[in-house]
């Protein structure tokens, strides 16, 4: 997260760290007791490493009573996701067992009504992604509030030049932005999960390259079918 600040500890109990061989790789969001939603491209970076999900964490390194690392029973990328595009960049991870819920571990309601968030709405994005252009990684969860940007502006030639489909949404990126390592994390508007950070190699913090988020409402049928 660029231009953000440290989150209040455990105030986002849905927040997950998707890890490979014990290292943070991507964000994720607990959407059901046994399921974490993340970005499909995160799996590509995992290679053949052991994928696990950390729940109940604020610090990645310090012991915390609520922290627990779960093995992944099944990884389900969206069937239409492709390595060369950010389309359908969603991944569902089934935990090896149901998460132990509590004040620091709790699923987040996700948007099912397929309607665009009003541009200008301030939404919260959180993650353990880099906090500087130099690539500094935080130990503790960061977050930032970002205004939603209308799709027409996001699709301008100076911005994402037509790449933003109806199944994506954008948020402003003027110095405050999601960045590398935040992919798969939640964009939360009004207490509801609206978007998932896409995992392209986008420049961060440049106002002409807004953050791109996969709209979960557009994938309600797929999410429901996997969780069923």
């Amino acid at each position: 997260i660029l231009g953000g600040r440290e989150a209040e500890a455990h105030a986002r109990p849905y927040m997950a760290s998707v890890q490979v061989n014990g290292e943070h790789l991507c964000g994720g969001v607990l959407v059901a007791e046994q399921w974490v939603l993340s970005a499909a491209h995160c799996l590509e970076d995992a290679a053949d490493g052991k994928v696990q999900v950390l729940l109940g964490a604020h610090s990645l390194s310090q012991p915390e009573p609520s922290k627990r690392l779960y093995d992944v029973l099944r990884a389900v990328p969206h069937p239409d996701s492709r390595p060369d595009t950010i389309d359908h960049d969603l991944l569902l991870l089934q935990l090896s067992e149901k998460a132990t819920l509590g004040p620091a571990v709790r699923p987040l309601p996700w948007q099912r009504v397929d309607r665009d968030v009003e541009p200008g709405t301030l939404c919260d994005v959180a993650g353990w992604g880099i906090v500087s252009h130099a690539g500094r990684r935080p130990d503790r969860l960061q977050h930032v509030l970002l205004p939603v940007l209308d799709r027409a502006t996001c699709n301008r030639r100076t911005h994402h030049d037509g790449a933003i489909t109806q199944r994506m949404m954008c948020a402003e990126s003027n110095r405050r932005d999601s960045c590398k390592g935040d992919s798969g994390g939640p964009l939360v508007c009004g207490g509801v999960l609206e978007g998932v950070v896409t995992s392209g190699s986008r420049v961060c913090g440049n106002r002409k390259k807004p953050g791109i988020y996969t709209r979960v409402a557009s994938y309600a049928a797929w999410i429901d079918s996997v969780l069923a």
Epitope: D150, R151, A152, N155, R156, R157, T158, G162, I164, Q166
Partner: antibody
Framework: EVQLVQSGAEVKKPGASVKVSCKAS????????MYWVRQAPGQGLEWIGE????????NFNEKFKSRATLTVDTSTSTAYLELSSLRSEDTAVYYC????????WGQGTLVTVSS | DIQMTQSPSSLSASVGDRVTITCKAS??????VAWFQQKPGKAPKGLIR???SRYSGVPSRFSGSGSGTDFTLTISSLQPEDFATYYC?????????FGQGTKVEIK
Amino acid sequence: EVQLVQSGAEVKKPGASVKVSCKASGYTFTSYYMYWVRQAPGQGLEWIGEINPYSGETNFNEKFKSRATLTVDTSTSTAYLELSSLRSEDTAVYYCAREGGFAYWGQGTLVTVSS
Amino acid sequence: DIQMTQSPSSLSASVGDRVTITCKASQNVDTDVAWFQQKPGKAPKGLIRSASSRYSGVPSRFSGSGSGTDFTLTISSLQPEDFATYYCQQYNNYPLTFGQGTKVEIK
């Protein structure tokens, strides 16, 4: 298939107004700005302005700001350019074009201003 | 306004020739430059965006380069269908502006 289909040719008298339409199909109309360009006979291309169909926000070339009005009807996915106080120098082909992604242009509308 | 000065204004060339058209911006426009091809009585057709990215379906003989203030469109081997007028456009700043055009004619 994306298409921008413009209204037919117009002949107007000096001082009159003209309204050119541009009907979009094959994509989500509100997801892309629409801009307008004109080309006088034998001349180059001149940018008039643009509109965000989602918000209605417009940006104009200062040269046209006082005389040009850009509007949209999202229910029919149509963009409009209205040019008032026409003079003979406004005789030109007027084009709409989608801003972003592939460079889609309308076929052009010839507006002739003659007394 | 940003002036886009295109040169030459016209050129004569033969099929198979390598053709280079240049466009100079009066101030820095990063890589926010597009190139269009226009044939008589037709709407302009996009060739290049972001100074060097070809639009899909555009033959590889068309290439663009440059950043800042100096931009080039190159046709590596001119084909009969390439005889047309070419325009550069900057979209970095309002108002968007075009070069005055380069007419490529048959020698």
